[in-house]
């Protein structure tokens, strides 16, 4: 089953997706779609990048990270209950059947009555505790694992943002894998 991410109505939702560019600026086309990843494409596309830039996006969907370094995590602004569902992140690596496909489940909860402290960035769930198993057909698509291809600088940034938050323990306990390439 896919990894689940949560956000409250009115918040921004964050769906992580990363890859490691072969060289700085040597980007790979990426698409985000609403719905599970089909066999070749991305479902109902909400955002797309090419080898140079973001070339298609719809309102409320944007990339908050540095996509030129492979951080293609999706931010959905001001979510509503209708934003719940499966999202597809597809990294369209050139070559024969090289695509990386990740299905992520977004669960939107009604807003809490009592205000809660917010982070600099809206992290919508504890980091997942499972690793990626990569496949090619939809039937073989597994789950997005614990922040693949993240580097130490990103971890440091995340830790700073999470300090003094209830998510700090989740980060510590998540078993997040760090790969430096």
């Amino acid at each position: 089953s896919e990894v689940e991410y949560r956000a409250e109505v009115g918040q921004n939702a964050y769906l992580p997706c990363f890859y490691t560019p072969a060289a700085p600026g040597n980007l790979v086309p990426v698409c985000w779609g609403k719905g599970a990843c089909p066999v070749f494409e991305c479902g109902n596309v909400v955002l797309r990048t090419d080898e140079r830039d973001v070339n298609y996006w719809t309102s409320r969907y944007w990339l908050n990270g540095d996509f030129r370094k492979g951080d293609v995590s999706l931010t959905i602004e001001n979510v509503t209950l209708a934003d719940s569902g499966i999202y597809c992140c597809r990294i369209q690596i050139p070559g024969i059947m090289n695509d990386e496909k990740f299905n992520l489940k977004l669960v939107i909860k009604p807003a809490k009555v009592t205000p809660a402290p917010t982070l600099q960035r809206d992290f919508t769930a504890a980091f997942p505790r499972m690793l990626t198993t990569r496949g090619h057909g939809p039937a073989e698509t597994q789950t997005l694992g614990s922040l693949p291809d993240i580097n130490l600088t990103q971890i440091s940034t995340l830790a700073n943002e999470l300090r003094d938050s209830r998510l700090a323990n989740d980060l510590r306990d998540s078993g997040a894998t760090i790969r430096i390439g």
Partner: antibody, heavy 119, light 111 residues
């Protein structure tokens, strides 16, 4: 109106090569996965290659290593390069547009081009 | 690969009658609640034409007498009242995984 027009078919000897072209019009070509599907005389349909909108390539084992697919979005064209051809590759080759947002099934087809592999 | 078996190979039907075509997959083609099965019609000398996608969705421009049903591994194409232009070969196709595969076809002929 969506149109797909194949060309490049013909007679080729076993072991030879052929390059098929598919000229597309009437839609935003770069947004769609494209496939080639073939049909041997009197037989059923067989999918032989696909290229996604992002340029990823897909083949069945029967042609992997012998066929390659490419696209030129500037020319609204898709190509099938066939090498090391065998008698069993004889077929009508159709260019087909994958359904937008999916790509795994085909909502528009060309009329096909016949490839005959024979000595 | 997913093998699709169509039956019968040939179906003899009179105009106005109902035709029921079957397609069985060697494994499930269910994916997140959707059945990734399609049906095509092909007439002699012509390219195939998409009739049904995702098991039961009728493609735009296809007459309402065509319908699809099924889930998992068993799928059916029904033509409620055969017209003269419906006599053709019908293929099922799965888009669950690579390689994409087609069934062997069912020929619907005039009885």
């Amino acid at each position: 109106e969506v149109q797909l027009v194949e060309s490049g078919g013909g007679l080729v000897q076993p072991g030879g090569s052929l390059r098929l072209s598919c000229a597309a019009s009437g839609f935003t070509f770069s947004r769609y996965a494209m496939s080639w599907v073939r049909q041997a005389p009197g037989k059923g349909l067989e999918w032989v290659a696909a290229i996604s909108s992002g340029g990823s390539l897909y083949f069945p084992d029967s042609v992997k290593g012998r066929f390659t697919i490419s696209r030129d979005n500037a020319k609204n064209s898709c190509y099938l390069q066939m090498n090391s051809l065998r008698a069993e590759d004889t077929a009508v080759y159709y260019c087909a547009r994958g359904r937008e947002a999916d790509g795994g099934y085909f909502d528009y087809w060309g009329q096909g081009t016949l490839v005959t592999v024979s000595s | 690969e997913i093998v699709l078996t169509q039956s019968p190979a040939t179906l003899s039907v009179s105009p106005g009658e109902r035709a029921t075509l079957s397609c069985r997959a060697s494994e499930s083609v269910e994916y997140y609640g959707t059945s990734l099965m399609q049906w095509y019609q092909q007439k002699p000398g012509q390219a195939p034409r998409l009739l049904i996608y995702a098991a039961s969705n009728v493609e735009s421009g296809v007459p309402a007498r065509f319908s699809g049903s099924g889930s998992g591994t068993d799928f059916t194409l029904t033509i409620s009242s055969l017209q003269s232009e419906d006599f053709a070969v019908y293929y099922c196709q799965q888009s669950m995984k690579v390689p994409l595969t087609f069934g062997g076809g069912t020929k619907v002929e005039i009885k």
